[in-house]
């Protein structure tokens, strides 16, 4: 059996020892349970010397980042892909991962995830722009493609534990977060629950047991606890704004 290793990291999707699986938020763990230490990528970085992190897919980036070519011109022409900052509400997008947590990509625009989109039986038309070197590219010729996907959605939203690919696959109050073998629908965190504070840096490995994000009106903040000796070991919890 591999030895347990303790690691304290604020890296997004870094792989500390597994923990907190059943209701996890994308990002690394703050509190750590014994387990296997999985290899990550880069060592810790500060914002001062932040380097763009090369990636092959969105999962290698933070939950507030997505994987893409830094300029459209470079896409599909051997241009390296890096983790880019997620796009805020009403910004243009090509897929869900480009939008910041709590948003999803609809008709090429980042929209708030209110779980009312894609109602059962509705015909949903999404414009997806595929770049040749992009994460979900259908064509390999390096030129942008615009495809209108029309799909009738008859299935019910995923319940807790259902396998998903994105949060829009999950029922209200759930998000899609990694749980090792796959991503599954997990509960959005409530007030007082342990959360993961995201930072745009760190050892960009992959966290396999993620937590969901904090629910509406809540923010992930350091728990005010005078018994904690150092900031690095403090728990973050979902707190009212």
């Amino acid at each position: 059996t591999l030895n347990s290793v303790l690691i304290n990291s604020n890296a997004i999707k870094n792989l500390p020892p597994p923990l907190g699986g059943a209701g996890g938020q994308p990002g690394s763990a703050v509190s750590v349970a014994p387990g296997v230490l999985y290899e990550g990528g880069n060592k810790y970085q500060t914002l001062d010397n932040y380097q763009p992190y090369p990636c092959a897919e969105d999962e290698e980036c933070g939950s507030d980042e997505y994987c893409s070519s830094p300029s459209r011109g470079a896409a599909g022409v051997g241009g390296v892909q890096i983790c880019l900052a997620c796009r805020k509400r009403r910004k243009r997008c090509m897929r869900h991962a480009m939008c910041c947590p709590g948003n999803y990509c609809k008709n090429g625009i980042c929209m708030p995830s209110d779980h009312s989109h894609f109602p059962r039986g509705e015909i949903e038309e999404s414009i997806i722009e595929n770049l040749g070197n992009d994460h979900n590219a259908a064509a390999g010729d390096g030129y942008p493609r615009r495809t209108t996907l029309t799909s009738k959605i008859y299935h019910t939203k995923g319940q807790e534990g259902s396998v998903c690919l994105r949060s829009s696959d999950c029922a209200a109050g759930l998000c899609c977060a990694r749980h090792f073998w796959s991503k599954i629908c997990k509960p959005v965190l409530k007030e007082g629950q342990v959360c993961t504070k995201h930072k745009r840096k760190g050892s960009h490995g992959l966290e396999i047991f993620q937590r969901c994000y904090c629910g509406e009106g809540l923010a992930c903040r350091i728990q005010k606890d005078h018994h904690q000796a150092s900031n690095s070991s403090r728990l973050h919890t979902c707190q009212r704004h």
């Epitope: 059943a22 979900n136 534990g161 090792f180 992959l206």
Partner: antibody, heavy 112, light 112 residues
């Protein structure tokens, strides 16, 4: 250290039921799912289903839907898998798994 | 018919490089579900070798690597060693079966 300790080998007659246990330690039991996977002698791995250790919610592979029951006891951090109406081809090693950690397996032999 | 197909056996001499394929379809690997690889020595539980397509747990030598493309995945073992002789399984999720699925398994023989 994360450990999943399974119950001992069982010999059952066709038509009977078997209940295999999996005791977890070294982590917060209710934070994870427990999966059950079986392997017949000389054969490959076959996923049977999972149980959410906290809520007790289950999902079973269609093949086992009518015969399997997964349960858990949070007070003892133990998961259970019961398979009923046993047939000879249910003879297999049954593993419990936390996905990243696996138990050593419980051999169930079905023989008349 | 198996959902994830692997060659039943592969072999190589010590020091050689071998590749094990895992062929799926648009409802599993091709649907963007992750692939994991397990090594199983005789009489033991599966051991995680590669997780989420191409990541290695600590303790797994860097001779082992994984990749995924389209509807298939591959496990490459560079610099074969005698202790690599084992069964290897790929694993993913299939959305048409609503089940986690394992590959058919590949027996690796190290010659000499």
């Amino acid at each position: 250290e994360v450990q999943l300790v399974q119950s001992g080998a069982e010999v059952k007659k066709p038509g009977a039921s078997v209940k295999v246990s999996c005791k977890a330690s070294g982590y917060t039991f209710t934070d994870y799912y427990i999966h059950w996977v079986r392997q017949a002698p000389g054969q490959g791995l076959e996923w049977m289903g999972w149980i959410h250790s906290n809520s007790g919610a289950t999902t079973y592979a269609q093949k086992f839907q009518a015969r399997v029951t997964m349960s858990r006891d949070t007070s003892s951090s133990t998961a259970y898998m019961e398979l009923s109406r046993l047939e000879s081809d249910d003879t297999a090693m049954y593993f419990c798994s936390r996905e990243d950690y696996w138990g050593k397996g419980t051999m169930v032999t079905v023989s008349s | 018919q198996a959902v994830l197909t692997q060659p039943s056996s592969v072999s190589g001499a010590p020091g050689q490089r071998v590749s094990i394929s895992c062929t799926g379809s648009s409802s599993n690997i091709g649907a963007a579900y992750d692939v994991h690889w397990y090594q199983q020595l005789p009489g033991t539980a599966p051991r995680l070798l590669i997780y989420v397509n191409n990541n290695r747990p600590s303790g797994v030598p860097d001779r082992f690597s994984g990749s995924k493309s389209g509807t298939s995945a591959s496990l490459v073992i560079a610099g074969l060693q005698a202790e690599d002789e084992a069964d290897y399984y790929c694993q993913s999720y299939d959305n048409s079966l609503n089940a986690y699925v394992f590959g058919t398994g590949t027996k690796l023989t190290v010659l000499g």
